[in-house]
């Protein structure tokens, strides 16, 4: 029977700069029941705080709701593991909410084949930003990436769409069924998961781009 091993805070993520969650990996348990607590202070403060919510983010997590989340403030956090034989502490982790945003995937991806009379046909897609993100505040610039592939192909073809919420693709294989997905990331932060796949059947008479 030993004191617990050193825990590690391995990830902090925010969906929208308004709330965030951090997760830790326990160290070895020393063969005894172990309690974990996350404490933090904000840079410039010495007032120590405890995690306000150990439930929302699941096991070994601390969730910071709206009232605990400050933009422009660096959080300095540490996890304490304690059992009957002693304690151990994680390294301090410095967290700035601005840099840990991982949005939800974009919504309402729609894909259509457009066949104008006077131009080459193309695949047109549009989508909406995730609902948790309020782009009107100007706090966010969201960038988008699209990927698509024929249903049976192994390789994805990826296109960067910048800040647009619509995109055209000209080069497609006629008669194929395509899977299309979109994802987004803030200017500072992490890519979202890919949106659910949307399927589109390319007509056999679709003319390939020269």
């Amino acid at each position: 029977q030993l004191p617990p091993g050193k825990p590690e805070i391995f990830k902090c993520r925010s969906p929208n700069k308004e709330t965030f969650t951090c997760w830790w990996r326990p160290g070895t348990d020393g063969g005894l029941p172990t309690n974990y607590s996350l404490t933090y202070h904000r840079e410039g403060e010495t007032l120590m705080h405890e995690c306000p919510d150990y439930i929302t983010g699941g096991p070994n997590s601390c969730h910071f709701g709206k009232q605990y989340t400050s933009m422009w403030r660096t959080y300095v956090m540490m996890v304490n593991a304690t059992n009957q034989m002693g304690s151990s502490f994680s390294d301090e982790l410095y967290v700035d909410v601005t840099y840990i945003v991982q949005p939800d995937p974009p919504l309402e991806l729609t894909v259509e084949v457009k066949q104008p009379e006077d131009r080459k046909p193309y695949l047109w897609m549009k989508w909406s930003p995730p609902t948790l993100i309020d782009l009107k505040t100007g706090w966010f610039t969201l960038l988008y990436e699209i990927r698509l592939k024929p249903e049976k192909a192994a390789e994805w073809e990826t296109h960067f769409a910048g800040q647009q919420t619509e995109f055209k693709i000209l080069s497609l294989h006629p008669g194929q069924k395509y899977l299309v997905q979109v994802r987004c990331k803030p200017d500072h932060g992490y890519w979202s998961a890919w949106s659910p796949a949307t399927f589109i059947q390319i007509p056999s008479d679709f003319i390939m781009n020269d």
Partner: antibody
Framework: EVQLVESGGGLVQPGGSLRLSCAAS????????MNWVRQAPGKGLEWISY????????YYADSIKGRFTIYRDNARNSLYLQMNSLRAEDTAIYYC???????????WGQGTMVTVSS | DIQMTQSPSSLSASVGDRVTITCRAS??????LAWYQQKPGKVPKLLIY???TLQSGVPSRFSGGGSGTDFTLTISSLQPEDVATYYC?????????FGGGTKVEIK
Amino acid sequence: EVQLVESGGGLVQPGGSLRLSCAASGFTFSSYEMNWVRQAPGKGLEWISYISSRGGTIYYADSIKGRFTIYRDNARNSLYLQMNSLRAEDTAIYYCARLSGVDIFDIWGQGTMVTVSS
Amino acid sequence: DIQMTQSPSSLSASVGDRVTITCRASQGISNYLAWYQQKPGKVPKLLIYFASTLQSGVPSRFSGGGSGTDFTLTISSLQPEDVATYYCQRYNSAPLTFGGGTKVEIK
């Protein structure tokens, strides 16, 4: 409605003891850090104690250190202040105050009066 | 411990006047400063935090400024309902010290 209600004040002799209670309702008490602030008659506000959400971190003002104890019972949504070795200068209205997530007192109770006199 | 000094300790001004209260910290506290209003016989009420962020529901005639050691609370146009004592408070570390208060009255 978010509310804090203090009780337990009264008249006590110097050297005596008193326990103040603060009952919280309308919010998730266990997620918030809590404080006691007092105000002597005709005087300003004086912060006297802080307790973190699960009770692991506690701070006291020098004026009460060693005489007063702050503690909480999250199951009962209650905050307490055990006051021992009371002095005349402890006479004041005692407020419990919720510390918001950005460390300011956003909700206050109505206060309970403590009078220390022989 | 860091001391918070408010000035003036009291002032009298006319309705519509611009009123400024100052608060000085004995050491730098970044912008970890709040202002509270306490009307006679009432409980203190939060006005401003992070030195300049207006608490929800507080009239826009109240504003805060400053950083480091020197801070101000300004009432742009004094109203009869603003008669109160105003307190600054630092909250970057314990003790969470209040200033001595400034009593604002109407002439």
